[in-house]
Interface confidence: low
């Protein structure tokens, strides 16, 4: 029988009546076009819905949009289009929602061809009121909020000007011309690239990287010969053209661009690319594309300075620049990432790491699944996860893998069980331990979401036919109940729940189609009465994360410490609640070789924890360029993994000596960098 449909599943009592009383329908007075939905603030219940409809006329396209607002998590909506003077809103800019709980919203309007500038509508009270503001420029990009101060906005114009507002879009000032890309850094700093000779495209590889720390009063050139730049964690990266040829190298700064070091990564040619897959304040995952149109590259993990890199994973699937990669941070368990590799026979396989890229392994075969036709050995195979690449290939995969930081250990994903990803219709699998073990959760493709910090999982079957049934589970996907939320089926377009998985409300979006017209409709279901009581201490159990061998003294140690969590028992049907905080108790582990990466010039042979010298560097002095000085590295081959908190135990020696020699890295050295003021 399908998972959750056997006799041992305890049923939730009287759930049909409870859900029926908490199901709210809203039919939108709209012709079907496109719909976009944004949550405004955290735990406010405020949702903005923008519907747009294009009527193609003979000479031009006439557009119409409507704006709706809910303040009860989508149970009721009010048409507030009049607050924006019935103006047509440009959907490509989306709704720019302010950071944290600022309550700020910016909508960018469509304006007629001859106008001097664009127009925005601004709200700072969670979309209760809007102020119309005419801009002195035509925006090219969505308004970007400073993460530190939501009154500070930046935008690029269609003329490549960099515009800044210090009063939430009321007044704008052009602080620089000829700008290609601009990003907020920390402390209200803006980084941007500029061109000198004509255009961003023409000057690619000859751009300058600039910084302003005072919103455009003064500037500092912090890099030349720039191809592109990126920010990740506390690292600033720039890819820089080499002097002699068309290759480029990554340079990294941890002081906002004042000083730079060349990253110990391979250089790339014109057709290749670098990509920051993930970054935090400790380290970076960097993808380096292989030469040629291979569709794969290598993942490297950095040290705590972002300079020395260790090879983490070969043949990492990443199709083209800005293309598809399956790299996924499993946010429900520290240190876990999932991605895909392209094997020699061009099949795609899923790999998982539990220690932040130190080791990668195949996903364990689910207990309740058989190996499919891709498996050579029917008794030995792995689970392979469908993610962005499968979605881009139009496989029958409606959703990418899902995990939430406050639903500890839970990962939900579409997958197939065999030697590689299959093009057959996938099933849905769940892990409750952060990816170590998996179970088939639902037959066939589904949309899914997590509510109440994992207390409820909701799913809807992916079907081309209209639907009227939703499935839900209160025991982490073991058992499922079905609820018919409407008598008249709808063409389903999406599930929406408040980001953060704390809510107990789910909105089902779709449209109804009749002979004459089609209309948007939403059904919002509140599960609060299913989880009747608040969870108590007895509802939680202690769980040791990353536990693979309870008999081992070091069991659960990942990155130098282990964590015990209080987790909801699967049998408990109760509310974690909106204020639920993950309870965890860390304890430090003693250092072993597993807590160290191989240093510059060393590598780890397969299935060995010891680092050995790279043959080509044997007997050579290890010297590299750091902050424009030649450095000599004395090492026995190990360096602590960034973020690793182990203490005691194994303690390999590592020392970096300044050789007092200058070295250049095709980059502007700090003393040559110029500053200027406006």
């Amino acid at each position: 029988s399908a998972p959750g449909e056997d006799e041992e599943c305890g049923r939730v009592r009287d759930f049909v009546a409870k859900l029926a009383n908490n199901t709210h329908q809203h039919v939108f007075d709209d012709l079907r076009g496109s719909v976009s939905l944004s949550w405004v603030g955290d735990s406010t219940g405020v949702i903005l819905v923008l519907t747009t409809f294009h009527v193609p006329l003979v000479i031009m396209t006439f557009g119409q949009s409507k704006l709706y607002r809910s303040e009860d998590y989508g149970k009721n909506f009010k048409d507030i289009t009049d607050l924006i003077n019935n103006t047509f809103i440009r959907t490509e800019f989306g709704m720019a929602i302010g950071p944290e709980n600022s309550g700020k919203v910016v909508l960018t309007a469509e304006v007629s061809g001859g106008s001097r500038g664009g127009r925005i509508f601004r709200s700072s009270d969670f979309a209760k009121n809007f102020v119309q503001t005419d801009l002195p420029f035509h925006p090219l990009t969505q308004m970007m909020y400073s993460p530190q101060n939501s009154d500070y906005l930046l935008a690029l114009s269609t003329e490549n000007g960099l515009w800044v507002s210090k009063n939430f879009g009321g007044k704008w000032e052009e602080i620089h011309k000829a700008v290609c890309l601009a990003k907020w850094g920390s402390d209200n700093t803006i980084f941007f690239t500029t061109y000198a000779n004509g255009s961003c495209k023409a000057d690619l590889g000859a751009l300058e990287l600039w910084r302003t720390s005072d919103l455009g009063k003064s500037f500092k050139t912090i890099g030349v010969k720039i191809y592109s730049f990126g920010l990740g964690g506390r690292f600033l990266f720039a890819s820089v053209m080499a002097d002699k040829d068309t290759t480029r190298r990554i340079h990294v700064s941890t002081d906002q661009g004042d000083t730079w070091s060349m990253a110990q990564l391979p250089s790339v040619g014109q057709e290749q690319f670098y990509s920051i897959l993930a970054a935090n304040d400790d380290m970076v995952f960097m993808h380096v594309d292989e030469p040629g149109d291979t569709g794969f590259g290598t993942i490297f993990t950095s040290d705590d300075r972002g300079i020395v890199y260790s090879k983490s994973l070969d043949r990492h699937l990443y199709t083209t620049t800005g293309g598809e990669t399956d790299f996924t941070n499993v946010t429900s368990l520290r240190g876990v990432y999932i991605t895909s590799v392209l094997s020699e026979d061009n099949s795609i396989q899923t790999m998982i790491t539990f220690d932040q890229g130190g080791r990668w392994t195949h996903l364990r075969k689910p207990e309740n699944s058989e190996c499919d036709a891709t498996a050579k050995n029917k008794n030995e195979c792995s689970l392979h996860i469908h993610a962005s690449y499968s979605i881009s290939q139009k496989l029958n995969v409606p959703m990418a893998p899902l995990s939430e930081p406050n639903a500890v250990g839970i990962v939900i994903a579409h997958g197939s069980v065999g030697d590689a990803i299959s093009v057959m219709v996938p099933d849905v699998y769940i892990s409750d331990d952060g990816g170590y073990s998996w179970t088939k959760m639902l037959e066939g493709p589904h949309y899914y979401t997590i509510l109440d910090s994992g207390g409820i999982i909701v799913a809807i079957e992916h079907s081309s036919r209209p639907i009227n049934v939703i499935k839900f589970s209160t025991d982490e996907g073991q058992c499922w109940q079905t609820y018919t939320f409407t008598r008249d089926p709808i063409y389903f377009t999406g599930l929406a729940s408040e980001p953060g998985a704390r809510s107990m409300n789910i909105s089902i979006w779709g449209f109804t189609e009749s002979f004459l017209t089609s209309q948007w409709v939403s059904y919002t279901i509140d599960f609060k009465d299913i989880l009747e009581r608040n969870c108590e201490e007895k509802d939680y159990t202690i769980w040791l994360a990353h536990s693979t061998d309870p008999e081992d003294y070091e069991d659960g140690c990942i990155l130098g410490y282990k964590e015990q969590f209080l987790r909801l028992r699967k049998s408990s049907v109760c509310q974690n609640g909106r204020d639920y905080v993950v309870t965890k108790q860390p304890s430090i582990c003693l250092c072993s070789l597993e807590d160290f990466l191989c240093d510059f010039g060393y590598y780890r042979p397969e299935n060995d924890s010891k680092c050995v010298e790279q043959p080509e560097l044997k007997g050579h002095d290890l010297e590299f360029c750091l902050y424009g000085r030649e450095e000599h590295l004395t090492t026995n081959g190990y360096r602590k993994i960034p973020g690793d908190k182990c203490q005691g135990g194994v303690n390999p020696v590592r020392e970096v000596k300044d050789l007092k020699k200058k070295c250049t890295s095709n980059f502007l050295s700090p003393e040559k960098q110029n500053s200027k003021s406006n």
Epitope: D552, Y553, E554, I588, L590, Q647, G648
Partner: antibody, heavy 117, light 108 residues
Framework: EVQLVESGGGLVQPGGSLRLSCAAS????????MSWVRQAPGKGLEWVAT????????YYPDILKGRFTISRDNAKNSLYGQMNSLRAEDTAVYYC??????????WGQGTLVTVSS | DIQMTQSPSSLSASVGDRVTITCRVS??????LAWYQQKPGKSPKLLVY???NLADGVPSRFSGSGSGTDYTLTISSLQPEDFATYYC??????????FGQGTKLEIK
Amino acid sequence: EVQLVESGGGLVQPGGSLRLSCAASGFTFNIYGMSWVRQAPGKGLEWVATISSGGIYTYYPDILKGRFTISRDNAKNSLYGQMNSLRAEDTAVYYCARHPGGAMDYWGQGTLVTVSS
Amino acid sequence: DIQMTQSPSSLSASVGDRVTITCRVSENIYSNLAWYQQKPGKSPKLLVYAATNLADGVPSRFSGSGSGTDYTLTISSLQPEDFATYYCQHFWGTPPWTFGQGTKLEIK
């Protein structure tokens, strides 16, 4: 019933060596970390060494590194402590303790080591 | 190294008294702390682990509390067999897993 019985203590001259043993019974020895802790006459407790369940990892305070070696034989349910270059300040009762992680939950009765000329 | 400061170093009390012994740690140890009791000529006995959990067979008059850097062992009603020396020990980071210097509890 969990039992830990130390042996091997005695009188030894400064600079000499001694091997302590601890025989374990009443529990599955090979799934627990084990530790040595000592107590000088009239003084407090001092952690000396720890070994992981499989014997892969060993840990010592800096002051004892190089002079004390902890080892175990899981087949014999035994823990050992090899002490070299003994000094007068190593005089103490040496306890072996079961160490599952966040505490030392069972202790032996101790064996006295006296370093004196 | 993490420093442990146990106080008082000794104290006199009577049967039936409520007694509190504290252990202050030089940095946050996230409740990774144990308490032991040792009687003269005997080996130590575990009372409390993970700051608040009573070990098997320990009478309920003993309790542990605290978090961060400050931890307390409380005996709610002192019994004659409780007169002993008490030690705290942390398990957050190594080396060393330091013990407190001990608190000697004597009959008044």
